[in-house]
Each structure stands twice: as structure tokens, then as C-alpha cells.
């Protein structure tokens, strides 16, 4: 009898259970009771990444300059090309399909996780005791100046923006 | 006991025609693909048709299509060759073979074609 | 077309000789190869499917292997009913093609 399911690594045509082809080649033409299906290599810059019955193969991903990708690792017959952005630069997406500039933390704002390829600098403000007077995608909230340690005292208070000022001590007369 | 009998052979003037038969018994034959294969005298083997379980589909490497046809009568458990514009490189023994697992499993004890003038 | 190529074309050996038969084919045909016997004045007979897949009531000492493009038939141990005609023949496209033969006789 002609079967109605086939087992994995094949598909149903005709009433007849035909192999898939393996990844990285494309079916040329279904198998017959005489013939194994036929199945043929992706050409250059090609790829399937399933055992398949695509009649064409995939076009790598292009990591396109122009849009601040570059080639992180080069694809294969049974691969894609992955793309990343350029330095300075991370993913709009998890396609990454173009790039945008890292975001920098206004002053009062610290890096709390510096941008990869693919996220963006996570900022976090500066909490009490903590400062940031730059825009910066690198820079993490200062702490403020211990006055004490140095033998001076405090003349103007911190913000999340600046730093103590300190003074010396007022002299007994 | 899958068997398998070939019959219609003989001699015959080039130019000309003859049809052979396969008389299947002791299997589904209506399951099965068929294949023709020939043995020129002293020679290897070469494939010359095959036609899918049902009767559908047909194949014929390219020195005898358009001269020869294959078909099958499931109801008579028969299948037939049907040779025409016949050439003497056409003298061979014909073997008919069940498709079994895509291999030639079982096959006739063949019926011989001679070709000549 | 696959053309398959079979070499030696002739092996001559003693029973119980181990024969190995080769079979190469012009292109890559994954597993796609069976292999036959063929005796004097007999129809062929099957003995592996599949390159490497045993046949229900053959002996033993027929073993196959390969993928691809090279093919191997062996016999480990040759006994006098071994000596015929062997072939390989390809389903990887149409059209079906043979090799031309190895002829395994006695020395």
C-alpha cells in the first residue's frame, strides 16, 4: 500500500516516500521507484540550512558597509553569512540588518553596561555619592571625592552631575 | 515465489518490429515498478526502460526513445516492450526486473532478440 | 550521464582468497550503488543495495562499502560458486547506468 507518512529525512510525493536532501545541496528532482532523489550542491555564495526539498538555494546574507555591518563570520553551503556592525556601532535588530551608533549616557547618567555589536550601552543614573559630568559611552558615575582622606572639607556639595569641592578646614584663631 | 517470465524474442530484419511480454507472478504486481534491461551477447548489462507501479510514468535512455514504448496491463499482471525501427545493435538478451527497494530484486530469465538480415 | 567505472576488469584467485572488486563513479552518488552477480547463461542477481545493505539469503562473505564516488565489493573468502560476472549499477539519476563488469575467475 502507498504510505501516508514517511519517515524523518523524508517527504511524501507521488505516494511515495522520497529522501530530503541533506544541507547545504537543493533538490534537483524527486526520487521515483527506480531513482533516489537527486540532489545538487548550493553554488557559491549559496546555503540551505535543513535536510530540504528547496529547488533553490539561499543567497548569503551581504554585510553591507554602508550600513555599518561588517562580516563576523563568512557563510558556508549549509551556513548564512553572520554580519555585525562596525566598532562604535551595534544591531538595530537580531537580524542585524543595519547599525546605528551607540548611545552615550548624558552627564548625571552612568554606563552601567557598555554596547557590544548587537546592544546598545545600557545607562543608569548616578545615585547618591555618585557623579557623571560627561556624555559618554564608556563612563561609568565617579564616585564623589572624599574631602576627609585628603584633610579638607567639603565647600560645595555633590550632584549627580559634579563633583564635591573641597576645602581646607576653617583655622582656629 | 516472486517469478517473472519474458517471452517474444526472436529474429527479426533491422528496420523492423516485435513485442516483448513479462508474465509476473507471486507479488503484487500492481506495487511494483518494472524495468527492462538488455545483455548484447558477450557484453554487460545496460538499462533500457522502466515504468512506475500504476503505469503513469515511463523512462528510456536516450538510444531507444521514440522507438521503443513499455507499458503494463495491471489487471493481467503483464508487462510489454514494444520494439520498432529495430537496428543490430539492438540484439541482446532482455531481462525484465522488479523494482524493489529502487534495485532490480528479482529478474527474468530473459528471451533473446536478434537483429538481423 | 553517471558513468560508473569497474576495475580490474578480470581478477583471477584461488577459492578462498579474499576478492575486493572496485567501482567508481564519475560524480558523487552518495549511497546510490547496488551491487550483482551474474553466472554463465543466468539471469543477474542482487546482492547489495544501498552500497553496504545485506540481501535476505546471501551469504555473509558479500560485504559492500563507499559513498560518493568509490565503491567496494568484497568477498571475504572465495568459494567456487563465487567465481562470475559482478556489477555495480547507480540510481542517483536517470539515466540507470552499469559498470562494465569485473569478472572474478578461478587462478
Known amino acids: 500500500e502507498p504510505p501516508t507518512a514517511c519517515r524523518e529525512k523524508q517527504y511524501l510525493i507521488n505516494s511515495q516516500c522520497c529522501s530530503l536532501c541533506q544541507p547545504g545541496q537543493k533538490l534537483v528532482s524527486d526520487c521515483t521507484e527506480f531513482t533516489e532523489t537527486e540532489c545538487l550542491p548550493c553554488g557559491e555564495s549559496e546555503f540551505l540550512d535543513t535536510w530540504n526539498r528547496e529547488t533553490h538555494c539561499h543567497q548569503h546574507k551581504y554585510c553591507d558597509p554602508n550600513l555599518g555591518l561588517r562580516v563576523q563570520q563568512k557563510g558556508t553551503s549549509e551556513t548564512d553569512t553572520i554580519c555585525t556592525c562596525e566598532e562604535g556601532w551595534h544591531c538595530t535588530s537580531e537580524a542585524c540588518e543595519s547599525c546605528v551608533l551607540h548611545r552615550s549616557c548624558s552627564p548625571g547618567f552612568g554606563v552601567k553596561q557598555i554596547a557590544t555589536g548587537v546592544s546598545d550601552t545600557i545607562c543608569e543614573p548616578c545615585p547618591v555619592g555618585f557623579f557623571s559630568n560627561v556624555s559618554s559611552a564608556f563612563e561609568k558615575c565617579h564616585p564623589w571625592t572624599s574631602c576627609e582622606t585628603k584633610d579638607l572639607v567639603v565647600q560645595q556639595a555633590g550632584t549627580n552631575k559634579t563633583d564635591v569641592v573641597c576645602g581646607p578646614q576653617d583655622r582656629l584663631r | 515465489e516472486v517469478q517473472l517470465v519474458e517471452s517474444g524474442g526472436g529474429l527479426v530484419k533491422p528496420g523492423g518490429s516485435l513485442r516483448l511480454s513479462c508474465a509476473a507472478s507471486?507479488?503484487?504486481?500492481?506495487?511494483?515498478?518494472i524495468s527492462w534491461v538488455r545483455q548484447a551477447p558477450g557484453k554487460g548489462l545496460e538499462w533500457v526502460s522502466s515504468?512506475?507501479?500504476?503505469?503513469?510514468?515511463?523512462y528510456y535512455p536516450d538510444n531507444v526513445k521514440g522507438r521503443f514504448t513499455i507499458s503494463r496491463d495491471n489487471a493481467k499482471n503483464s508487462l510489454y516492450l514494444q520494439m520498432n525501427s529495430l537496428r543490430a545493435e539492438d540484439t541482446a538478451v532482455y531481462y525484465c526486473?522488479?523494482?524493489?527497494?529502487?534495485?532490480?530484486?528479482?529478474w527474468g530469465q530473459g528471451t533473446l532478440v536478434t537483429v538481423s538480415s | 550521464e553517471i558513468v560508473l567505472t569497474q576495475s580490474p576488469a578480470t581478477l583471477s584467485l584461488s577459492p578462498g582468497e579474499r576478492a575486493t572488486l572496485s567501482c567508481r563513479a564519475s560524480?558523487?552518488?552518495?549511497?546510490?550503488l547496488h551491487w550483482y552477480q551474474q553466472k554463465p547463461g543466468q539471469a543477474p542477481r542482487l546482492l547489495i543495495y544501498?552500497?553496504?545493505q545485506s540481501i535476505s539469503g546471501i551469504p555473509a562473505r558479500f560485504s559492500g562499502s563507499g559513498s560518493g564516488t568509490d565503491f567496494t565489493l568484497t568477498i571475504s573468502s572465495l568459494e567456487p560458486e563465487d567465481f562470475a560476472v559482478y556489477y555495480c549499477?547507480?540510481?542517483?539519476?536517470?539515466?540507470?547506468?552499469f559498470g562494465g563488469g569485473t569478472k572474478v575467475e578461478i587462478k
Open positions: 526486473a522488479r523494482a524493489g527497494e529502487k534495485a532490480m530484486d528479482y
Open positions: 507471486g507479488f503484487t504486481f500492481s506495487n511494483y515498478g
Open positions: 515504468i512506475s507501479s500504476g503505469g503513469d510514468n515511463t
Open positions: 560524480q558523487t552518488i552518495n549511497n546510490n
Open positions: 544501498y552500497a553496504s
Open positions: 549499477q547507480q540510481f542517483s539519476s536517470w539515466p540507470l547506468t
